[in-house]
Structures are given as structure tokens and as C-alpha cells.
Interface confidence: low
């Protein structure tokens, strides 16, 4: 039978009664257009809408813009458009919301083609009252927030000026010219770059990096000749055109670019493209794209440097720069990533790591399933996970993977069954345990999202026709109960709850369709009367992540130790509650070869521990670059991977000798760099 | 105008290979899917599989799997079906259709099925000793 | 695999008068239902999508209905032009099936 639809499914008690009890409708008074949303705060319950229609005139395109506020989580919404002087917001660069509890909200207008600046209207008020204030230039990105200090914002104008504020974009102040691209990085520092001749474009490969610690009263230059730059942890990236030819390689700083370091990694030509898949002040997950149209590429991962790294997948998908790839984080659980790779014969299959990148595994086929049509093997197969490659190729795919850091172990995710990814319309399923065991939690796409720290799973079905039914579970999709929660139903376009996944509130937002008129709609459904009472110490079980194996002494070691979790029991129907903290308890492992990847010039042989030299490499030096610097390298091979915080047991020795030559980099070093101030 | 077009007849004996091509035009090649349907003389429609010009990736009905297989060329815009070990069965129509395959293209919401929407002329092919 | 079940076989109608076909699925296919015209030495032609959906071109005395596992294919008026083989065609789950096809012809 279908997942919840057996004998041992407990009805949960009037169900139907509470919840009615707690739907609330608000009908916008909205022709039908866009509609955005937007969560101001954490546990504020403050939601701001911006819907925007648009009428095409014959000369011109005429829009119009209502904003709406609600402070109760989205049960009741008021038309704030008037503390925006009814003006048209462009939805291009959506709402700003500041970072943390700032209560900063910045929207962006429509001006008329002849004014001299843009104009924006801001709140530091959780949207309670907004100030209009008229830009001195015409904004090409959205506001970008420092975020050590919600009061400091840069932009980046049409004309390629980078503006920066600082008092909530009261003044602002062109700070420089001929920017491409400007991030904030730690401390209130700017990183972006410049070109000198014709534009952006033409200049590729021969920007300027730049950097400012005091809002553009001084500068520095910190490398030239850049084509990007990204950062990622406490990782600064940037990739340089080498001197002789058109390829580029990746240099790494973790000084804000005052040393940088050439990464051990494959040069890439003008077609292919480098990608910070993952970061974290450890380690760095990166995509190096393969010559030619292929649409894949090799992940490597980093040492805690950024330097050296090692092959960690092939073939991995990814389509093309800014394209799709499949790579997702498992937040639900340390050291999980699921991603697709492109096999030779062009399938695509699903790939899965539980040691941060150490080596990848395909997710076992769910006990419930049976192989489709792609699997040769009727009998043996694996579930591939739907993400982004999927939906980009219109599948039938509502979502991307779900899994929430204080939800822990759940993963959530449409699928299918057989040797690689099918275009056939694929079901929902669910691990309870970080991706190791997976099971059919939904027949048929489903929209889906997590409540009360995965007290509540909430579903709807992905569907053409309006819909009136929401199904929600309270025991880790295993059983599921059906609520219809209005009459007339209403063309589905979203689940929205808030971030964080603590709250036990979801807005269903739909439009209603008649012969003359369409209207946005939305339902709010509060399930905190399903959850009746808090939960207590009983409720909660001790599980041991990554365990696979429970004779084994190490069983549950990653990443060199072990974490015990108190979790929620399946069969629990209570409230963790919006102050829920995952509770968890580590101990350090010994030491194994698995806590250690390969060195550079090393790789592990398929099913093998050990690291072995790369034939290629075999009785050469290694030598690398090291803040400009060549380093000679004396290894046996191994090198302890980021984080991994293992003691005692077996310790391979690394050493590194400094030969004190100058690398052969032609990045800026640190002693031709320069300093200006304005 | 929006069109498929399959390559001529074919005769063919028991145990032999054919391989039928269909070429695409007046739309965005990768942008749909390809199915590939057969007919046998005074029976129904027979759906063989399905291929994804993007990637390559195919799937195929039971049936057919291990005898048949689809390819594409994205350069020439061209699908192939080869089908191998051919019997006297095999004798049939074969057409390609393009196959949104769940892709929206504007519905109120989500996605649904949209129906293979343009169709080949069909290549007869016939398996006689 | 989904089987599709077609009925009747033949229907016989006069021309002007309605024409209603039915296909039943072995399981729900949700509203993933085409049906398609097929006239003799012809490739198939879409007329619905979706259950319900005409397709481009397609005159409007051509109707779909149902979702799950009935569904109804509906000629209001028929015109001699309409006399053909029409199948029903799911694509729920793979693989892709099609019904046997009725054949609507002139009584």
C-alpha cells in the first residue's frame, strides 16, 4: 500500500476541528500579476508581500505595486502601499532585507526615464514605517547589507560607479569607478574589481582587484590581471590569467588578499569555468570544468589552506558557468553532499558523500521500491535524487532537496528508482538518517517543507488542477493524514513557512480563477493545536549519527569523531517548540587512514584506503606555490582532512621543505601590491 | 514551421539491425524531449522509449531493452533509434514524436503532461527473410 | 507497467450526432492523459493534453474530461472529417502506454 495508507497508521485525534480552527484566509484585493514574499526577522513573524502587475500599453508598460504587511506569521495581512506612497517597486531587485534581527527592509522603485537617480524607500522598523529617500545614480544590483553592520550598504550603479552608504542609505557616496563586481567580505571590508580601458566584458582577464577596509577612504590593490573572484569561508579566490596563453588559474588568500598562494589545481581555457561549490572556514568544495562542451567537470577538495587539493569526484555535472549542478548540502546532517555525475554513457546518476567529499557512494535503494525501466538489473539499483539539473529541464520536479540543520538526519527529495536519473514523474522520499537509508514517502511530485524542527512534515501536491487539500505527517512521513482546508480551490503557486523550519505556521498561496477576475489568495495554517503539549526527555531517543555498523568500536566516526543525538520518537505527537536546540553529544576517534586524504601527487585507488603515487608523478619532486614562494614537498602521501578533529592511532608524518625560489606566478606578490588613498 | 523528419523505408532481415533518423527544425532542439512510437500493420501504438537531447539520457520500455537504442547528434538536431536482432514482428511503423515529457509551458500551475505534439511522417520497416 | 483500456472497440455514429469514447487506467495517472486522432496512412495527431486541454488547432467540439483513473473523450458534433482511430495515452509513470485505440466510423 501507499506510504501511510497501511493499518498501522494512527489517525491523529480531531485533527480536522484544530486546524479549522486555525486556517486563515486573506484575499488580496490584486489583480493577479507576481507576487513576492519575504521574511523580515527571525521569529518576528513579520511577512512582507509585494505583488506587482503589469499592463502593456501599447507605448509603454504601466505597473503597479501593492505591499502588504502581516505580523502574525501571515494569518492577517494590511495594506501598507500608502507608507510607500503608492509607488511601483521594480520586483528585479526584490526586497533587501537586512541581516540578522536588523529589522532593515530596502525597496527599490520605478523612476520616470529623465530622473537624475533611482529611488528607494527605507525601514529600520520591521516595515512598520518606511523614509523616501532619491538616489544620486541609477542602481544596477540590489542593496548589498555588510553583514557586521546592517547600517553600511553598497550598490553598484548603471554606470558601473560603486556607491557605498553609511547610514542605512540616507547619503550615499561614490567611492569608485569602473567597478564589475563588488563583494562585502569579514570585518566591513569591500573586495571588488575594475577595468581600466573599454568595459567589464572587454576587460576580462585583465581586472584589477581591489580592496577597502575603511568604506573607500583608502585602497589597495591586490592582484591584477583577474578574470573573477569569490569568496567562500575565510577563503578569498581569484582567478588569474596565466602570462603566456589564454588559460587561468585559481590563486587563494586567507589574509583578505595581502599573500596570495597559487591552488594546486587544473589551469582552465577561455570555455570552461571554475566553481565554489561549498565552503566552510575548514575546507573548500571546487568544480574545475573539462575542456570542451561536456557538461561536467572534476570536484577536488582543499587542505585547510585552500592550497592543495585532491580529486574528490569525476564527471561531476555541471552544466555550464552559472548553469546547473546538482550539489547539495546536506545541512541535516555533518559532512553529508549529494550531487549527480554524467556517466559514459549519458545517463545521469546520483552521488552521495558522508565524509565530506572523501569518497562518494551511490544512495541505497529504498526497501519499498522497486528498479524502473532504466535499471538492467531488476533487482539492484539506487534511488537518484531530482535537483537542479532536473527542475532547469522542466521535469516534473516542484522542489530541490530539503534537509534543515536543527531537523536532524531528514532529507527530503523527489526521485527515482533504476540505474541512473529518470524523465519519468518521480515520487517523494525521505531518510530519517542523513542519506543512508531512504524510503517512498509521496507517490507523485509534491511540494514540501519542515515545521517545529521536523515535528511536522507538511506536503502538497504538485498538480494542474486548483487544489484544496494539504497532507501533513508528525512522524517522519511514515503516515500521513489529509486536511482540506477550503472549499473552493485555488491554483497552488507556493508553501511558504519561515525560515529555520522552528515555525508550526505554512502559508499556502494560490490565486483564484473566475470568468472575470483572478485574485491572490493565501492560507495560513497554524498547527500548533495537532502538536497539543511541549515535548519532555521522554519523548526524545538517543541516535548515533553515520552509524553503519554497531559491533564496530568506531562505528559512527567521521571526520575523526562521533556525535550521539537526542531526537524526537517517530511515534511523538508534541511541540519541540520554537527555543528547540539540537542536543549532541561528540567524542574524539582514533586516527585511520580514513581520516586522511591523499596528499597531492597521491590518489586512493577505487575500494582502497590507502593513498599510492600518481603514476605521472612517480620519482618527481612535487613542488607547489606558497605565498609566492616554491615549496618542495616530502610526503608519504597523506594529509588530514579539514576538521577532522580525530586524536592518537595512525599519524602519517607530512613535512615541507622551503626552497625559497620564487614561484612562477604572475600574480601581483605581496611586495609589488599598492595602497592609495582617496 | 515546427517539424520532424524521418529517414526513408527500410527491408531488413531477421537478425539484422536498423537504424531510422529524425531530424528536428523550427524549434529549440534541446528544449523537448523524443519519444519514439511504433505501429505494427492493423494494430495500436507502441511506445518504445524516450530520449533527452540535452544529456543523452534515454529510458526504454521493458520490451525493447537491450534491443533498441536512441541516440542524438545536437549539431545536426537529429535523434537515431537502432534497433537490433530484428524478427519478423518488428515489422511496423516507426515514428518519432516530440515529447514535452511533464515540461510547462504555461500552465496556471505546476506541470502536467502536455502530449507528444508534433509527430514524424513514420518509416515503414519491414523484417523478411 | 499502467495498462489503458479503450471502449468500445468501434463506435458507430451518424454524423452531427456525439461521440463519447472512454479509457480507463489501471491505476491513477493523475490528469498525465493524452488522447490523439489517427486517420488511415496518417502519424497520430494530439488533440488533448492534460485530461482536459485542447490542443493548438484543435475545433472545439473536441472535449477531454476526468483525472485519476476515468477519463472521457468527447466529440459534440461529428463531421465527416472526424471519422478516425483514437487512442488514449498516459504518462504518469514509465513506461509510456497507450490504449488499444477506438475507431469511430460512420453508421
Known amino acids: 500500500s501507499a506510504p501511510g495508507e497501511d493499518e498501522e497508521c494512527g489517525r491523529v485525534r480531531d485533527f480536522v476541528a484544530k486546524l479549522a480552527n486555525n486556517t486563515h484566509q486573506h484575499v488580496f484585493d490584486d489583480l493577479r500579476g507576481s507576487v513576492s514574499l519575504s521574511w523580515v526577522g527571525d521569529s518576528t513573524g513579520v511577512i512582507l508581500v509585494l505583488t506587482t502587475f503589469h499592463v502593456p500599453l501599447v507605448i509603454m508598460t504601466f505597473g503597479q505595486s501593492k505591499l502588504y504587511r502581516s505580523e502574525d506569521y501571515g494569518k492577517n495581512f494590511k495594506d501598507i502601499t500608502d507608507l510607500i506612497n503608492n509607488t511601483f517597486i521594480r520586483t528585479e531587485f526584490g526586497m533587501a532585507i537586512g541581516p540578522e534581527n536588523s529589522g532593515k527592509v530596502v525597496l527599490t522603485a520605478e523612476v520616470s526615464g529623465g530622473s537624475r537617480g533611482g529611488r528607494i524607500f527605507r525601514s529600520s522598523d520591521f516595515a512598520k514605517n518606511f523614509v523616501q529617500t532619491d538616489l544620486p545614480f541609477h542602481p544596477l544590483t540590489q542593496m548589498m547589507y555588510s553583514p557586521q553592520n546592517s547600517d553600511y550598504l553598497l550598490a553598484l550603479s548603471t554606470e558601473n560607479g560603486l556607491w557605498v552608504s553609511k547610514n542605512f542609505g540616507g547619503k550615499w557616496e561614490e567611492i569608485h569607478k569602473a567597478v564589475c563586481l563588488a563583494k562585502w567580505g569579514s570585518d566591513n571590508t569591500i573586495f571588488f574589481t575594475t577595468y581600466a580601458n573599454g568595459s567589464c566584458k572587454a576587460d576580462l582577464g585583465a581586472l584589477e582587484l581591489w580592496r577597502t577596509s575603511d568604506l573607500g577612504k583608502s585602497f589597495k590593490t591586490i592582484g591584477v590581471k583577474i578574470y573573477s573572484f569569490g569568496l567562500g569561508g575565510r577563503f578569498l579566490f581569484a582567478s588569474v590569467m596565466a602570462d603566456k596563453d589564454t588559460t587561468r588559474r585559481i590563486h587563494v588568500s586567507t589574509d583578505q588578499g595581502d599573500t596570495w598562494s597559487m591552488a594546486q589545481l587544473p589551469s582552465v581555457g577561455q570555455e570552461q569555468f571554475y566553481s565554489i561549490l561549498a565552503a566552510n572556514d575548514d575546507m573548500v568544495f571546487m568544480h574545475v570544468d573539462e575542456p570542451g562542451d561536456t557538461g561536467f567537470g572534476t570536484i577536488f577538495t582543499s587542505d585547510d589552506r585552500g592550497i592543495v587539493y585532491s580529486k574528490s569526484l569525476d564527471r561531476h555535472l555541471y552544466t555550464t558557468t552559472g548553469g546547473e549542478t546538482d550539489f547539495t548540502n546536506v545541512t541535516s546532517l555533518r559532512g553529508v553532499y549529494i550531487t549527480s555525475v554524467l556517466s559514459e554513457d549519458n545517463s545521469i546518476q546520483t552521488m552521495i558523500t558522508f565524509d565530506q567529499g572523501g569518497r562518494w557512494t551511490h544512495l541505497r535503494k529504498p526497501e519499498n521500491s522497486e528498479c524502473d525501466a532504466t535499471a538492467k538489473n531488476k533487482n539492484e539499483c539506487s534511488l537518484h535524487i531530482h535537483a537542479s539539473y532536473s527542475i532547469s529541464q522542466k521535469l516534473n520536479v516542484p522542489m530541490a532537496p530539503l534537509s534543515e540543520p536543527n531537523a536532524v538526519g531528514i532529507v527530503i527529495a523527489h526521485g527515482s528508482v533504476g540505474d541512473a536519473i529518470s524523465v519519468m514523474v518521480p515520487d517523494v522520499y525521505i531518510s530519517d538518517d542523513g542519506g543512508y537509508s531512504w524510503t517512498k514517502m509521496l507517490e507523485g511530485p509534491h511540494y514540501y517543507t519542515i515545521l517545529d524542527s521536523g515535528g511536522i512534515i507538511v506536503a502538497i501536491e504538485h498538480s494542474s488542477r486548483p487544489i484544496n487539500v494539504i497532507k501533513f505527517s508528525t512522524d517522519e512521513g511514515q503516515c500521513w493524514q489529509t486536511y482540506t482546508f477550503t472549499r473552493d480551490p485555488i491554483y497552488f503557486t507556493g508553501l511558504a513557512s519561515e525560515p529555520g523550519a522552528r515555525s508550526m505556521n505554512i502559508s499556502i498561496w494560490g490565486f483564484t480563477e473566475s470568468f472575470l477576475t483572478s485574485q491572490w489568495v493565501s492560507y495560513t495554517i497554524d498547527f500548533k493545536d495537532i502538536l497539543e503539549r511541549n515535548c519532555e526527555e521522554k519523548d526524545y531517543t538517543i541516535w548515533l549519527a553515520h552509524s553503519t555498523d554497531p559491533e564496530d568500536y568506531e562505528d559512527g566516526c567521521i571526520l575523526g569523531y562521533k556525535e550521539q543525538f537526542l531526537r524526537l520518537r517517530k511515534s511523538s505527537v508534541c511541540q519541540n517548540g520554537r527555543d528547540y536546540v539540537v542536543t549532541k553529544q561528540p567524542s574524539i576517534c582514533l586516527c585511520s587512514l580514513e581520516d586522511f586524504l591523499c596528499d597531492f601527487g597521491y590518489y586512493r585507488p577505487e575500494n582502497d584506503s590507502k593513498c599510492v603515487e600518481q603514476p605521472e608523478l612517480k620519482g618527481h619532486d612535487l613542488e607547489f606555490c606558497l605565498y609566492g614562494r616554491e615549496e618542495h614537498l616530502t610526503t608519504n602521501g597523506y594529509r588530514k582532512i579539514p576538521g577532522d578533529k580525530c586524536q592518537g592511532g595512525v599519524n602519517p608524518v607530512r613535512e615541507v621543505k622551503d626552497l625559497k625560489k620564487k614561484c612562477t606566478s604572475n600574480f601581483l606578490s605581496p611586495e609589488k601590491q599598492n595602497s592609495k588613498s582617496n | 514551421q515546427v517539424q520532424l523528419v524521418q529517414s526513408g523505408a527500410e527491408v531488413k532481415k531477421p537478425g539484422a539491425s536498423v537504424k531510422v533518423s529524425c531530424k528536428a527544425s523550427?524549434?529549440?532542439?534541446?528544449?523537448?524531449?523524443m519519444s519514439w512510437v511504433r505501429q505494427a500493420p492493423g494494430q495500436g501504438l507502441e511506445w518504445m522509449g524516450i530520449?533527452?537531447?540535452?544529456?543523452?539520457?534515454?529510458s526504454y520500455a521493458q520490451k525493447f531493452q537491450g534491443r533498441v537504442t536512441m541516440t542524438r547528434d545536437t549539431s545536426t538536431s537529429t535523434v537515431y533509434m537502432e534497433l537490433s536482432s530484428l524478427r519478423s514482428e518488428d515489422t511496423a511503423v516507426y515514428y518519432c514524436?516530440?515529447?514535452?515529457?511533464?515540461?510547462?509551458?504555461?500552465?496556471?500551475?505546476?506541470?502536467?503532461?502536455?502530449?507528444?505534439?508534433?509527430w514524424g511522417q513514420g518509416t515503414t520497416v519491414t523484417v523478411s527473410s | 507497467e499502467i495498462v489503458m483500456t479503450q471502449s468500445p472497440a468501434t463506435l458507430s455514429v451518424s454524423p452531427g450526432e456525439r461521440a463519447t469514447l472512454s479509457c480507463r487506467a489501471s491505476q491513477s495517472v493523475s490528469s498525465n492523459l493524452a488522447w490523439y486522432q489517427q486517420k488511415p496512412g496518417q502519424a497520430p495527431r494530439l488533440l488533448i493534453y492534460g485530461a482536459s486541454t485542447r490542443a493548438t488547432g484543435i475545433p472545439a467540439r473536441f472535449s477531454g474530461s476526468g483525472s485519476g483513473t476515468e477519463f472521457t473523450l468527447t466529440i459534440s458534433s461529428l463531421q465527416s472529417e472526424d471519422f478516425a482511430v483514437y487512442y488514449c495515452q498516459q504518462a504518469r509513470l514509465g513506461p509510456w502506454t497507450f490504449g488499444g485505440g477506438t475507431k469511430v466510423e460512420i453508421k
Open positions: 523550427g524549434y529549440t532542439f534541446t528544449s523537448r524531449y
Open positions: 514524436a516530440r515529447d514535452p515529457s511533464g515540461i510547462a509551458l504555461a500552465g496556471p500551475a505546476g506541470r502536467y503532461y502536455y502530449g507528444m505534439d508534433v
Open positions: 530520449i533527452n537531447p540535452v544529456g543523452g539520457s534515454t
